[in-house]
């Protein structure tokens, strides 16, 4: 008959598994099964026989079945034996990759690659990669005491870097043993990389402010760089130095805030890999009371005005107030307080009141005091600009600039200036034994030339307390100086001429230069001398003139600066009449005589008078002066017709007297012929 | 420094139970195959039990295979040996060992009526 | 089981002598592997054993080269060329290639 075993010879178990060794005939029909190991150890196994058949399970295989298994197969009387070498190893798990913490970038990290209960390890071999690159590889050869299942490691380090991210860390683990072909011999563990990086850059802000006051608010928002972003926790710091967790929000608000508040805060932002933290400290006063003092911490109050002083409280709802100088003189105002207000009147101000006004107000057991400085000035009216008297080109005149009622006196300045060009200044830096309002003056004396007019003169007063503030600091007026000029070059105009025939019309116009432009002024003169007003226009017209209207006109060009004159003669000439021709002292004469012939025209100045001798043989022109023509001891020829005419540019007339001469001797009278 | 120190000894009745403890400290506990391992009064030294380095498999002497348990937990580094119906000849001082290298200062099971 | 037998069971010498020690096993401890997974221990008074030897001849750290194992199959021998004071103590032989792991009864090394 014949034995077979099942496997045949060689048999490879896995430590856990269940091994089951089988043992069968063939030829014998009723065989009798027997089972040992090679050295007669324990079986550590169960037998079970089934006709020609006979199987040891061994469950679990441990190291005690690491024998040569026998099985007997007797038939009648013979033997047969076969033998089944069992073989253990152990190699259950995948690898295992452990980092020593999570990868952050730039920090190295060591990675473990660990393989469970192995056996034999002396045929573990490992491998380590980081995506296709081989970062290490080991085979495990150290001794050992005896047979053990063993993990294993592999370990490296190495430093991430972010590009590493998304890569993948391959453990590769082999068991090197000959005919392990139904087992797997390389066994790997694949973990991908996720590259950190640990908090950093926390930054806490705080609105709106670290120092808050009782019952205020604040908001707190904190912020940390990383990957993964990190979570932001908040915390405060208690006395002994614990923190109590508040929120794990970025942004922290804090509302009706006590004094217990106050603290430092600690933000931290946390991720995977680590933590950073950012500390800040709130300070939560207690709800402090405030005092206003108003227009300000000083004032400047004119003299005489009326100035009310308010003292405000916040954040007290019954205050008590009171109002002291600081130099504990009498307050002299009026105080009016209700609420959580407190007025202080000083009305009229005056040098009494030039102090620091203190407002002290309680508020339960707290006290506080704010001061207003009262500073006095005067300063309420513009300059005033004077002249010794009127402007006259070239004639010296007294400036005054009188500043009015001015404090402080030895801070004022005052600048007299025409046009552009400063004429005077002067400050009046004089020391006063007491506070009075004064007036002050700047006086100058100077010499206005025609180019002055126009000008403006200025008086500039300037009270110079930089410190006080009022309006205004400087006060100025301003006058335009008009220089006068004496009436001059005065001339007269006659149209058509000064001498015209009686019934036509004269315009006489007067021109007169100076400054004011002077104003005309017509008079006509008389005979006594005196003059008769005419007119106040600067043309004097005279229409149908008749000949009384000859004579003197004056004509006067007259401002303040002074006057002057400019006469015309008028003469109206009218056709000659009226003559009278006569002789003296008679027409009849005795030879001998003074004969006075005279030629008159009453009504008619500047007449030609022409007196002639009538003669057949032509006339003869006398000699007269003023149309009288004396015949000193007349003789017979001097007898004749005389003849006068009266003439002038309008026309003439003739008059005519025969003049007899009587001869002495015969009484005869000559009689010239006619 | 590689150290083993067992506590949980003590003196039982027979059929009583006790569990030893092994704390590991000084290597990578959980790397490692750890046994038990118990000398006579006379001073034999008998191979106890012992367990893979991942938990997974366990082996003993015949002497008292279900009787006692081996675990450990690689998180504390702790080694166990729970035993129960302990008889006299189970008297001895246990040592917890890794390999037979490292060797604890033992602790001492007496069973006794 | 495998059995170990340590000769003698107990050993006088001088100090400054050299000692042997004998361990015999009942089967090969030859591993499959090529591997001879045979050790040796010493006890010294009032202390837990050490590991002086292990695969028969490899000597652990700090162990004094005038200790010596030799051997192979079942025969084993451990040798100490002169023997100083710190070497008193209960030597075991052990083994761990057949399960269960088996210790031999121990020599006591002591001064004549």
């Known amino acids: 008959f014949k034995i077979e075993t099942t496997p045949e010879s060689r048999y490879l178990a896995q430590i856990g598994d269940s091994v089951s060794l089988t043992c069968s005939t063939t030829g014998c029909e009723s065989p009798f099964f027997s089972w040992r190991t090679q050295i007669d150890s324990p079986l550590n196994g169960k037998v079970t026989n089934e006709g020609t058949t006979s199987t040891l399970t061994m469950n679990p295989v441990s190291f005690g079945n690491e024998h040569s298994y026998l099985c007997t197969a007797t038939c009648e009387s013979r033997k047969l034996e076969k033998g089944i070498q069992v073989e253990i190893y152990s190699f259950p798990k995948d690898p295992e990759i452990h980092l020593s913490g999570p990868l952050e970038a730039g920090k190295p990290i060591t990675v473990k690659c660990s393989v469970a209960d192995v056996y034999p390890f002396d045929r573990l071999e490992i491998d380590l990669l980081k995506g296709d690159h081989l970062m290490k590889s080991q085979e495990f050869l150290e001794d050992a005491d005896r047979k053990s299942l063993e993990t294993k490691s592999l370990e490296v380090t190495f430093t991430p870097v972010i590009e590493d991210i998304g890569k993948v860390l391959v453990c590769r683990a082999k068991l090197h043993i000959d005919e392990m072909d139904s087992v797997p011999t390389v066994r790997q563990a694949v973990k991908e990389l996720q590259v950190y990086i640990s908090p950093k850059n926390t930054v806490i802000s705080v609105n709106p402010s670290t120092k808050l006051q009782e019952g205020g608010s604040v908001t707190m928002t904190c912020s940390s760089e990383g990957l993964p972003a990190p979570e932001i926790f908040w915390s405060k710091k208690l006395d002994n130095g614990n923190l109590q967790h508040l929120s794990g929000n970025a942004t922290l608000t804090l509302i009706a805030m006590r004094m217990e508040d106050s603290g430092i805060y600690v933000c931290e932002g946390v991720n995977l890999i680590g933590k950073n933290r950012k500390e800040v400290e709130l300070i939560v006063q207690e709800k402090p009371f405030t005092v206003e003092i108003s227009p300000g911490p000083r004032i400047a109050a004119q003299i005489g005005d009326s100035v009310m002083l308010t003292c405000s409280v916040m954040g007290c709802e019954s205050p008590s107030f009171s109002w002291r100088t600081q130099i504990d003189s009498p307050l002299s105002g009026k105080v009016r307080s209700e609420g959580t207000n407190s007025t202080l009147t000083l009305s009229p101000v005056s040098f009494e009141n030039e102090h620091s006004y203190l407002c002290t107000v309680t508020c339960g057991h707290k006290k506080l005091e704010k001061g207003i400085q009262v500073e006095l000035y005067s300063f309420p009216r513009d300059p005033e600009i004077e002249m010794s008297g009127g402007l006259v080109n070239g004639s010296s005149v007294t400036v005054s600039c009188k500043v009015p009622s001015v404090y402080p006196l030895d801070r004022l300045e005052i600048e007299l200036l025409k046009g552009e060009t400063i004429l005077e200044n002067i400050e009046f830096l004089e020391d006063t034994d007491m506070k009075s309002l004064e007036n002050k003056s700047l006086e100058m004396t100077f010499i206005p030339t025609i180019e002055d007019t126009g000008k403006a003169l200025v008086c500039q007063a300037k009270l110079h307390i930089d410190d006080m503030e009022f309006e205004p600091k400087q006060r100025q007026s301003t006058q335009t100086l008009y220089v006068n000029v004496a009436p001059r070059d005065t001339t007269v105009l006659v149209s058509p001429s000064s001498i015209l025939e009686e019934g036509s019309s004269v315009n006489m116009t007067c021109l007169s230069q100076g400054f004011p432009a002077p104003k005309i002024l017509w008079s006509r003169q008389l005979p006594n001398g005196e003059l008769q007003p005419l007119s106040e226009n600067a043309t004097l017209t005279l229409i149908s003139t008749k000949m009384e209207d000859s004579g003197v006109y004056l004509c006067e060009g007259i401002n303040q600066a002074g006057r002057s004159r400019k006469e015309v003669e008028l003469i109206i000439q009218v056709t000659p009449k009226d003559i009278k021709l006569t002789a003296f002292p008679s027409e009849s004469v005795k030879e001998g005589d003074t004969v006075i012939i005279s030629c008159t025209c009453g009504n008619v100045p500047e007449t030609w008078i022409i007196l002639k001798k009538k003669a057949e043989t032509g006339d003869t022109v006398l000699k007269s002066i003023d149309g009288a023509y004396t015949i000193r001891k007349a003789q017979l020829k001097d007898a004749g017709v005389y003849e006068c005419e009266s003439k002038n540019k309008v026309g003439s007339q003739l008059r005519s007297l025969t003049l007899d001469v009587q001869g002495r001797e015969n009484n005869k009278d000559y009689f010239s012929p006619e | 420094e590689v150290q083993l120190v067992e506590s949980g000894g003590g003196l039982v009745k027979p059929g009583g139970s006790l569990k030893l403890s092994c704390a590991a400290s000084g290597f990578t506990f959980s790397s490692y195959t750890m046994s038990w391992v118990r000398q006579s009064p006379e001073k034999r030294l008998e191979w106890v039990a012992e367990i893979s380095s991942g938990g997974s498999y366990t082996h003993y002497a015949a002497t008292v295979t279900g009787r006692f348990t081996i675990s450990r937990d690689n998180v504390k580094n702790t080694l166990y040996l729970e035993m129960s119906s302990l008889r006299s000849e189970d008297t001895a001082m246990y040592y917890c060992a890794r390999g037979e290298l490292y060797w604890g200062q033992g602790t001492l099971v007496t069973v006794s009526a | 089981d495998v059995v170990l037998t340590q000769i003698p069971s107990t050993l006088s010498v001088t100090f400054g002598q050299p000692a042997s020690i004998s361990c015999k096993a009942s089967?090969?401890?030859?591993?499959?592997?090529?591997?001879?997974?045979f050790n040796w221990l010493l006890q010294r008074p009032g202390q837990s054993p050490k590991r002086l030897i292990y695969l028969v001849s490899k000597l652990d750290s700090g162990v004094p080269d005038r200790f010596t194992g030799s051997g192979s199959g079942t025969d084993f021998t451990l040798k100490i060329s002169r023997v100083e004071a710190e070497d008193l103590g209960v030597y075991y032989c052990w083994q761990g290639t057949h399960f269960p792991w088996t210790f031999g009864g121990g020599t006591r090394l002591e001064i004549k």
């Open positions: 089967q090969s401890l030859l591993d499959r592997g090529g591997k001879t997974f």
